[in-house]
């Protein structure tokens, strides 16, 4: 069965600065990739970054630069902007999407005793997953 | 402009075949995952067959699966629905429509359908 | 496959009224959209990912929902929105409409 995975971490060098990996284990090719912040996507959260692997990326603020990393993972880095870091205690979530077959979500967050630089562990949690 | 137009459709005998074509224009067809969907006299709309990946790939209902062919050319701009053992619940105006990406592969641009009467 | 029930079937509503329409899913959905479709014409996509309006659509359209409760909402009924509504779900294939909205204006 697919499952995605997603890892949230603080730099080390910014502490205002934090990049989400994630991953997508399983077969088929991915046809696209939404990063959402706050809960799931369409259920909550708010869009930061939408990948396609041919035809570029869309990003949206406090997103910084979302790329991919191989064909199955991404990373989206986040400039926060606040003095309090919000993003410690925000939930990330990815969903990657096979067209037309379907869809895997997946939601993670930095864990409270992370230390800068450290990267969280993997932590999935599927919110939805194809029929 | 992007365009799709439709052609190929008329009366058949159930048992017969047809084949449709979308001819289309105004985009670079081959970046694009084409569906036919058609609507029943009744008026419900039903997918009928997807092609992504150049054609490589290609997904159909359990209604018309091993009775409906889809395929491409994209050196032709054209999307073919080769359709055999046809029923009368075929019956249906046939669109061909693209779907874009970023839109979440909405259908985005739809032809105007060709009609498609399966009657004895 | 995932069945997507639409209500009301039929409706009518008077220009300037507000209206509402909505789309149940037999189980949650990945995507949602909504397409309009007026008499002797092929469907036009209104609304993307749930609540995203399509290029050139006015508006006083909107969508919202997620799982398997979703709904169209037009703030200012106008002579032009009478047409037939079907929402559309791709979660895996096949991708499936629903019956459709009906919407005639009094």
């Known amino acids: 069965t697919p499952e995605v995975w997603v890892q949230v971490q603080m730099e080390a060098t910014e502490l205002s600065s934090f990049t989400v990996h994630c991953g997508f284990l399983g077969p088929g090719s991915i046809s696209l990739v939404t990063v959402s912040w706050g809960g799931p996507d369409g259920a909550g959260g708010t869009k930061l970054a939408v990948l396609h692997p041919e035809l570029g990326t869309r990003q949206w603020a406090p997103a910084r630069q979302a790329r991919w990393e191989t064909q199955s993972s991404i990373s989206l880095a986040l400039e926060d902007s606040g003095a309090s870091s919000p993003f410690a205690n925000t939930t990330f979530c990815c969903k990657f999407a096979s067209f037309p077959e379907g869809s895997w979500e997946s939601c993670g967050s930095l864990p409270p005793s992370s230390d800068p630089g450290l990267s969280a562990p993997p932590t999935p949690v599927p919110i939805l997953r194809a029929d | 402009e992007v365009q799709l137009v439709e052609s190929g459709g008329g009366l058949v005998k159930p048992g017969g075949s047809l084949k449709l074509s979308c001819a289309a224009s105004g985009f670079t067809f081959s970046n694009f995952a084409m569906s036919w969907v058609r609507q029943t006299p009744a008026m419900r709309l039903e997918s009928v067959a997807t092609?992504?990946?150049?054609?490589?790939?290609?997904y159909y209902p359990d209604t018309v699966k091993g009775r409906f062919t889809v395929s491409r050319d994209n050196a032709k701009n054209t999307l073919y629905l080769q359709m055999s053992s046809l029923r009368s619940e075929d019956t249906a105006i046939y669109y061909c429509a693209r779907h874009d990406d970023f839109l979440y592969y909405a259908m985005d641009y739809w032809g105007q359908g060709t009609s498609v009467t399966v009657s004895s | 496959q995932i069945v997507l029930t639409q209500s009301p079937a039929i409706m009518s509503a008077s220009p300037g009224e507000k209206v509402t329409m909505t789309c149940s899913a037999s189980?949650?959905?990945?995507?949602m959209f909504w397409y309009q479709q007026k008499p002797g014409s092929s469907p036009r996509l209104l609304i993307y990912d749930t609540s995203n309006l399509a290029s050139g659509v006015p508006v006083r359209f909107s969508g919202s929902g997620s799982g398997t409760s979703y709904s169209l909402t037009i703030s200012r009924l106008e002579a032009e929105d009478a047409a037939t509504y079907y929402c559309?779900?791709?979660?895996?294939?096949?991708?499936?409409f629903g019956a459709g909205t009906k919407l005639d204006l009094k």
């Open positions: 189980s949650s959905v990945s995507y």
């Open positions: 092609i992504v990946n150049g054609g490589i790939n290609t």
């Open positions: 559309q779900q791709w979660t895996s294939y096949p991708l499936t």
